[in-house]
């Protein structure tokens, strides 16, 4: 049986939830890691794409070391949510020229999808500050050509694997800090 | 053909500093962590630190925190790294190397700079 | 941090026979569908080369008679039939946590 009623939950172990985390966070980073080299594979397209509407590169925001762990997953959140919006984006708007790379789209979606539930957990099991609601963001102008889809899409999926590189990074330096 | 070129070998004295460079090419920079080993006589592999070349700074093994320092150059293509403070501990061969981003496995070395500490 | 040890420590050969060499680490190192863990041979004055990464995927230039097979504490590595360029120094790394480390190294020797 479990704790009698009105006792309080026992407190969770923060480097194993911590720990959960960084696990769905590397999987995910995997996952967009074989989606990039096949959209590499299948529309080659050289040198850097940009988006103005995804968000300015998490490592920007200071040097990892120097990280808390409320700022990390409050970041990483927002950040998340935002390249959420831009995959759901993607496949709307890109679904035919894309279809070659579904289900994996799909699947990273779900996967984002689930890491933002993680991530909205731990923060509410570490007791740190609950963000507001997002307000609601612009909706995203459809592209201007096929081409323009593509180098959308390498721009996603590159913004997206250089945050969760930093996510597991600062994640896995902060579990050694606990 | 992608490869790492390090600079030559260095003869220091203790309480001196070297700094050793890494210049990629072959490869887009930026796509990987640059990781740094350090192979000492008779002694494991062991992993100083690495650093993302788009920003955010380094991070360290705790054992090398203070006195490594990672930097890259960007427009270079190069990263260095500097270890302050020598001791004889510190002579071994220190490698650069590229990691793949979130798993810390190295799937291309450099050539190895050999770092003698003596007095 | 977390320990690799390596078994054997030195390991004499013929060229044509089986290797398997043995890595342990001191917690779990596999978690959700990986493993990491990586192999990487060294030769005597060279850098070390990837060899397997996340436990059993080969890297892109190595010859199929290697393959890396294992999950949680326990992981191998195979050389199914040895050849004169494999006598070298293997080492074992994980990257489940920081920092990551490497085992003490196994050599392979000629008979």
């Known amino acids: 049986p479990g704790p009698p009623p009105g006792s309080p939950r026992a407190s969770p172990d923060p480097r194993a939830e911590l720990d959960s985390t960084v696990l769905l966070t590397r999987s995910l980073l995997e996952d967009t890691r074989q989606l990039t080299i096949q959209l590499k594979d299948k529309f080659p397209a050289d040198g850097d794409h940009n988006l103005d509407s995804l968000p300015t590169l998490a490592m920007s925001a200071g040097a990892l070391g120097a990280l808390q762990l409320p700022s990390v997953l409050t970041r990483l959140r927002a950040d998340l949510l935002s390249y959420l919006r831009h995959v759901q984006w993607l496949r709307r708007a890109m679904g035919s020229s894309l279809k070659t790379l579904e289900p994996e789209l799909g699947t990273l979606q779900t996967r984002l999808d689930r890491l933002l539930r993680r991530l909205q957990l731990l923060m509410s099991r570490l007791a740190l500050p609950q963000l507001p609601p997002d307000p609601p963001a612009p909706p995203l102008a459809p592209p201007s050509s096929t081409w323009g889809g593509i180098r959308a899409a390498h721009a996603i999926l590159g913004g997206l694997h250089l945050t969760l590189d930093w996510a597991v990074r600062g994640l896995l330096l902060l579990k050694t800090r606990l | 053909e992608v490869q790492l070129v390090q600079s030559g070998a260095e003869v220091k004295k203790p309480g001196a500093s070297v700094k050793i460079s890494c210049k990629a090419s072959?490869?887009?920079?930026?796509?990987?962590?640059m990781d740094w080993v350090k192979q000492a006589p008779g002694q494991r592999l062991e992993w100083i630190g690495d650093i993302n070349p788009h920003g955010g700074g380094p991070i360290y093994n705790q054992k090398f925190t203070g006195r490594a320092t990672l930097t890259v150059d960007k427009s270079a293509s190069t990263a260095y790294m500097e270890l302050s403070s020598l001791r004889s501990e510190d002579t071994a061969v220190y490698y650069c190397?590229?990691?793949?981003?979130?798993?810390?496995?190295?799937?291309?070395w450099g050539q190895g700079t050999t770092v003698t500490v003596s007095s | 941090d977390i320990v690799l040890t390596q078994s054997p420590a030195s390991l004499a050969l013929s060229p044509g026979e089986r290797a398997t060499l043995s890595c342990r680490a001191s917690k779990s190192v596999s978690t959700s569908g990986y493993s990491y863990i990586h192999w990487y041979q060294q030769k005597p004055g060279q850098a070390p080369r990837l060899l397997i990464y996340l436990a059993s995927n080969l890297d892109s230039g190595v010859p199929a008679r290697f393959s890396g097979s294992g999950s949680g504490t326990d992981f191998t590595l195979t050389i199914s039939s040895l050849e004169e360029e494999d006598f070298a120094t293997y080492y074992c790394q994980h990257s489940r946590d920081l920092p990551p480390t490497f085992g003490q190294g196994t050599k392979l020797e000629i008979k």
């Open positions: 190397a590229r990691g793949e981003l979130g798993h810390w496995y190295f799937d291309v």
């Open positions: 072959g490869y887009t920079f930026t796509d990987y962590n």
